[in-house]
Amino acid sequence: ATKLTEEKYELKEGQTLDVKCDYTLEKFASSQKAWQIIRDGEMPKTLACTERPSKNSHPVQVGRIILEDYHDHGLLRVRMVNLQVEDSGLYQCVIYQPPKEPHMLFDRIRLVVTKGFSGTPGSNENSTQNVYKIPPTTTKALCPLYTSPRTVTQAPPKSTADVSTPDSEINLTNVTDIIRVPVFN
């Protein structure tokens, strides 16, 4: 039986949540993947998704969320930069595989963001001052906003999530489109 668990991460405002979703199977490499929030009494809401098919090493940015799919490693990297208290909540990663129901990629993450800068190496005190010049070309998010409750009953693999420093300067305004950005090196 599938063991559904949560991993709790307590971070400070301004820090970055860095999650790697291990999708294990090669057949999922080009599948569209999404990062979702689950609010009490609601269906999971999609916050960001990769393109369809999901491209290798091709960062997609939606506001403060960056998705990067690395087919060679079987990993989807999800980052939420410049965390705010209101980002606190329950998150999950899913794979879209229509016409089938989407399924989770790993244990859910319970994110708790508190005020105040921790001063730990993994954080970025000045992250709100970072500016990334967004390319003029954007594409609309071609993924469903909501997922059937059945999503949570199916699932492949695991994840880890940690504090990290943002790898590049990112515009932290609210952006609703999917934005293609250069690879972060």
């Epitope: 599938t2 063991k3 860095d18 790697k20 291990d22 294990t24 199977l25 090669e26 090493s57 990067e68 690395y70 060679d72 490693h73 079987g74 990993l75 990297r77 399924h103 989770m104 790993f106 190496p121 993994g122 199916q154 699932a155 492949p156 693999p157 695991k158 880890t160 940690d162 504090v163 990290s164 420093t165 790898d167 972060f184 090196n185």
Partner: antibody, heavy 117, light 111 residues
Framework: EVQLVESGGALVKPGGSLRLSCAAS????????IHWVRQAPGKGLEWIGR????????KYAPKVQGRFTISADTSKNTAYLQMNSLKTEDTAVYYC??????????WGQGTLVTVSS | EIVLTQSPATLSLSPGERATLSCRAS??????????MNWFQQKPGQAPRLLIY???NQGSGIPARFSGSGSGTDFTLTISSLEPEDFAVYFC?????????FGQGTKVEIK
């Protein structure tokens, strides 16, 4: 071409320290995990631990927790294994590996660590 | 930790024969609908090579004669027809939970 090259293996006395390096090429270590595995002479394989170089998160086997430390320098695309308080039973070939399919792929050639007085 | 037990310790076979290697876990390595069991091949003086991941998926460039099966606690690696280069030591490994663990290995030798 994906390649991992370990270095730093040596003969060291019990109680001593050693740092092994794992230089990666053909991929960016920030986008994966790097694992360390060892193999004592004529014995089986033993997973030591792994690092997520993007954020420094590490996990270790209980046997080495506290004595061994895995780190990474993403600017050099290199991972490290710092080994302290070495014991004779730490004598082994040490491998670093990349990650794929919830397991380990892309293995280095290994580097020999001998702990002896 | 999850303990993996491989059998037999040694398998003596001739080229062209079928090899069946077993790996038993002390507890289930299944989760999320996937079996987190992997198989590696190692030849003397060489690093291990990933053969099978997630119980039944072939690693990159692995010949079709290698196949994996099983779920829960019991897993099998099958080599349908042994080639001379297949005589080596084979290890199973679980990645369901930390610490990741290996079996003690099965040596496939020429009869």
């Amino acid at each position: 071409e994906v390649q991992l090259v370990e270095s730093g293996g040596a003969l060291v006395k019990p109680g001593g320290s050693l740092r092994l390096s794992c230089a990666a090429s053909g991929f960016n270590i920030k986008n994966t995990y790097i694992h360390w595995v060892r193999q004592a002479p004529g014995k089986g394989l033993e997973w030591i631990g792994r690092i997520d170089p993007a954020n420094g998160n590490t996990k270790y086997a209980p046997k080495v927790q506290g004595r061994f430390t895995i780190s990474a320098d993403t600017s050099k695309n290199t991972a490290y294994l710092q080994m302290n308080s070495l014991k004779t039973e730490d004598t082994a070939v040490y491998y670093c590996t990349g990650h794929y399919g919830s397991t380990m792929d892309y293995w280095g050639q290994g580097t020999l660590v001998t702990v002896s007085s | 930790e999850i303990v993996l037990t491989q059998s037999p310790a040694t398998l003596s076979l001739s080229p062209g024969e079928r090899a069946t290697l077993s790996c038993r876990a002390s507890e289930s390595v299944d989760n999320y609908g996937i079996s987190f069991m992997n198989w590696f091949q190692q030849k003397p003086g060489q690093a291990p090579r990933l053969l099978i991941y997630a119980a039944s998926n072939q690693g990159s460039g692995i010949p079709a004669r290698f196949s994996g099966s099983g779920s829960g606690t019991d897993f099998t690696l099958t080599i349908s027809s042994l080639e001379p280069e297949d005589f080596a030591v084979y290890f199973c490994q679980q990645s369901k939970e930390v610490p990741w663990t290996f079996g003690q290995g099965t040596k496939v030798e020429i009869k």
